[in-house]
Interface confidence: medium
């Protein structure tokens, strides 16, 4: 790597993937193994992120960009740049302090992450329940009773049994 000749700041010409080495008369030196510089003119290289444990490598570190991690199966990313991995739950569950717990009656979760949320209240829109909700699925709203033609009726399956007490004590 040639010495930079900038009169302003001799380091400004050092490209990404290098650092301006004060110990070597401000020569642009390549980043050492397991380090990177994503912008030019840097006086040090940053240590590459290591994807260990529940993290797995999504993109390897290069001299110009940091490694990117995601989560091993059974976990999903949380936080900027996947700074944390949070446990997946099954559909119909949510993650609590005590691990995955079934959704309380009247709520559902159709994903492996996030929270149980209340079933849609069909009556607020003047509709009736066409299909009852479950822990995994929201209710399906149908036309209001007044919209049904004479003799027709909305099919309402029996309500699911109340879940055992998962609400806070």
């Amino acid at each position: 790597f040639e010495r930079t000749r900038s009169l302003q700041d001799p380091c400004s010409n050092c490209p990404a993937g290098t650092f301006c080495d004060n110990n070597r008369n401000q020569i642009c030196s390549p980043c050492p193994p397991n380090s990177f510089s994503s912008a030019g003119g840097q006086r040090t290289c940053d240590i590459c992120r290591q994807c260990k444990g529940v993290f797995r490598t999504r993109k390897e570190c290069s001299s110009t960009s940091n490694a990117e991690c995601d989560c091993t199966p059974g976990f999903h990313c949380l936080g900027a740049g996947c700074s944390m991995c949070e446990q997946d739950c099954k559909q119909g569950q949510e993650l609590t302090k005590k691990g995955c717990k079934d959704c309380c009656f009247g709520t559902f979760n159709d994903q492996k992450r996030g929270i149980c949320r209340p079933w849609t209240n069909c009556s607020l829109d003047g509709k009736s329940v066409l299909v009852n909700g479950t822990k995994e699925r929201d209710v399906v709203c149908g036309p209001s009773p007044a919209d049904l033609s004479p003799g027709a009726s909305s099919v309402t399956p029996p309500a699911p049994a109340r879940e055992p007490g998962h609400s806070p004590q």
């Epitope: 936080g79 944390m84 993650l95 996030g114 149980c116």
Partner: antibody
Framework: QMQLVQSGAEVKKPGASVKVSCKAS????????MYWVRQAPGQGLEWMGI????????NYAQKFQGRVTMTRDTSTSTVYMELSSLRSEDTAVYYC????????????????WGQGTMVTVSS | SSELTQDPAVSVASGQTVRITCQGD??????AGWYQQKPGQAPVLVIF???NRPSGIPDRFSGSSSGNTASLTITGAQAEDEADYYC???????????FGTGTKVTVL
């Protein structure tokens, strides 16, 4: 990291409505549940409600049911909070906020906040 | 009225440790988030989940949880830690969120 930019301060008369906007810097904002929180002068934080921009799901605090409406415009990555029938007690800074992890974290933790919009209700 | 209760105010000598608590039935099931707010500024998340710190938050901030109580501890408090601190979590129905009443921390 996503940033949230809110609309400017408003002065309203009692009985009027106010609509505050919150624009996200990322087009992936449909991955993020958006929360609205307010703070009256000298008072604590108060949760108003939540909207999921991906499916328009809303969940409002009991106190604001019937007076608050949260909407979104995915084409501009913007969410809105409209509060009607304003009274003097609604004078507050209104914040939109979100969790950078995306989704509706079980923690309800909010690590991205707008700068706040001061709404003054005065006759 | 808030479902999460905090002590209104607490003082700590610079360099000492202070513990702020947040009580509520929903905390038996859900973790709390903790926020620092300085005058005229938006709140800043300092702890969430079991004991997770967002990037940029000093490691003198830590969180813990037992029963219906969540705690935020500042070990070696600094002058810049003087602020209002709020907890938040789901409410006891699990369907809404709620903030604690807030604790004013003064560093002497």
């Amino acid at each position: 990291q996503m940033q949230l930019v809110q609309s400017g301060a408003e002065v309203k008369k009692p009985g009027a409505s106010v609509k505050v906007s919150c624009k996200a810097s990322e087009h992936t904002f449909t991955s993020y549940y958006m929360y609205w929180v307010r703070q009256a002068p000298g008072q604590g934080l108060e949760w108003m409600g939540i909207i999921n921009p991906s499916d328009d799901y809303t969940n409002y605090a009991q106190k604001f049911q019937g007076r608050v409406t949260m909407t979104r415009d995915t084409s501009t990555s913007t969410v809105y909070m409209e509060l009607s029938s304003l009274r003097s007690e609604d004078t507050a800074v209104y914040y939109c906020a979100s969790f950078n992890g995306g989704g509706n974290s079980v923690f309800g933790a909010l690590d991205i906040w707008g700068q706040g919009t001061m709404v003054t209700v005065s006759s | 009225s808030s479902e999460l209760t905090q002590d209104p105010a607490v003082s700590v000598a610079s360099g000492q440790t202070v513990r702020i608590t947040c009580q509520g039935d929903s905390l038996r099931r859900y973790y709390a988030g903790w926020y620092q707010q300085k005058p005229g500024q938006a709140p800043v998340l300092v702890i969430f989940g079991k004991n997770n710190r967002p990037s940029g938050i000093p490691d003198r901030f830590s969180g813990s949880s037992s029963g219906n109580t969540a705690s935020l501890t500042i070990t070696g408090a600094q002058a810049e830690d003087e602020a209002d601190y709020y907890c938040n979590s789901r409410d006891s129905s699990g369907n809404h969120y709620v903030f604690g009443t807030g604790t004013k921390v003064t560093v002497l």
